[in-house]
């Protein structure tokens, strides 16, 4: 299991249920790099933190998955959590 994957999971598990729901909704509309597709809405909304981490890594790989997760956290006003996630992935 990679460091970035662990860091993503750690961040998502630290969200409240309401925040995790908001994270998924923002993830649906976040601007993506060219060549990447959005995770399908139907699959996304029912996922827990563990499933969502797996899906983020399978869709975007670890490095970009962590960056994308950090950006969505920033969009939610969770800059500190985003910084911790990025620091953990760059250790």
């Amino acid at each position: 299991m990679g460091r970035a994957r662990d860091a993503i999971l750690d961040a998502l598990e630290n969200l409240t249920a309401e925040e995790l729901k908001k994270f998924k909704l923002k993830l649906l509309s976040v601007p993506l790099r060219e060549g990447y597709a959005a995770i399908p809405r139907g699959a996304l909304l029912s996922m827990d933190a563990l499933d969502l981490t797996d899906k983020l890594v399978s869709f975007y790989l670890e490095t970009y998955g962590a960056e994308l997760t950090a950006n969505v956290l920033r969009d939610m006003g969770l800059q500190e959590m985003a910084g911790q996630l990025q620091a953990a992935t760059h250790q």
């Epitope: 923002k26 509309s29 976040v30 601007p31 950006n71 920033r74 969009d75 939610m76 006003g77 800059q79 500190e80 910084g83």
Partner: antibody
Framework: QVQLQQPGTELVKPGASVKLSCRAS?????????????LEWIGNINLSNGRTNYN??FRAMATLTVDKSSSTAYTQLSSLTSEDSAVYYC?????????????WGQGTSVTVSS | NIVMTQYPKSMSLSIGERVTLRCKAS??????VSWYQQKPEQSPKLLIY???NRYTGVPDRFTGSGSATDFILTITSVQAEDLADYHC?????????FGAGTKLELK
């Protein structure tokens, strides 16, 4: 158009405290602007869960709270000096991405004077 | 803390001129930069967010560009109502920080 409601003026004595209010929603920021100066971010509070973030520069003098029942955010500013005479704005972040401050109150002008 | 440096501090210009305002971040802030317009005795108003996204109702003569550390606000043909202070701000990291502002004045 969201309207953030703030009282217009407050006159307080040096060393005293003042509690500013703002009818708002979501993330509410507090921003200080001294006459002829730039903008300084004091901190923010999430009205739905009470999560706060502070600028360390203001942590000792500003306390951010929320009354969910009235959707009102407050900042209590304590031990005020003349340096704290400024306009204090509240602002919301409602745009889904990049966390800008898209709605601003009209500001409360605080004058610290004996 | 991330320092946002704006330049020039002020600009004197004529109506119809093209204006370029610059903002430099002390470290990489991705695209997490916004531009605000503030007229005398008024609250700031959001113009641009995410470095290049025009906010609802903002005229298309305002354009934002840049990423990482260097950002630009361009006004293609300045109008009388554009004479104001312009602030850039970053929302990449706490504390959120703003530049000192650029004042646009009439020549």
């Amino acid at each position: 158009q969201v309207q953030l409601q703030q009282p217009g003026t407050e006159l307080v004595k040096p060393g005293a405290s003042v509690k500013l209010s703002c009818r708002a929603s979501g993330w509410t920021h507090w921003v200080k602007q001294r006459p002829g100066q730039g903008l300084e971010w004091i901190g923010n509070i999430n009205l739905s869960n009470g999560r706060t973030n502070y600028n360390e520069k203001f942590r000792a003098m500003a306390t951010l709270t929320v009354d969910k029942s009235s959707s009102t955010a407050y900042t209590q500013l304590s031990s005020l000096t003349s340096e704290d005479s400024a306009v204090y704005y509240c602002a919301n972040s409602m745009v889904p991405h990049f966390f800008p401050m898209d709605y601003w109150g009209q500001g409360t002008s605080v004058t610290v004077s004996s | 803390n991330i320092v946002m440096t704006q330049y020039p501090k002020s600009m004197s210009l004529s109506i119809g001129e093209r204006v370029t305002l610059r903002c430099k971040a002390s470290e990489n802030v991705g695209s997490y930069v916004s531009w605000y317009q503030q007229k005398p005795e008024q609250s700031p108003k959001l113009l641009i967010y995410g470095a290049s996204n025009r906010y609802t109702g903002v005229p298309d003569r305002f354009t934002g560009s840049g990423s990482a550390t260097d950002f630009i606000l361009t006004i293609t043909s300045v109008q009388a109502e554009d004479l104001a202070d312009y602030h850039c701000g970053q929302s990449y990291n706490y504390p959120l920080t703003f530049g000192a502002g650029t004042k646009l004045e009439l020549k």
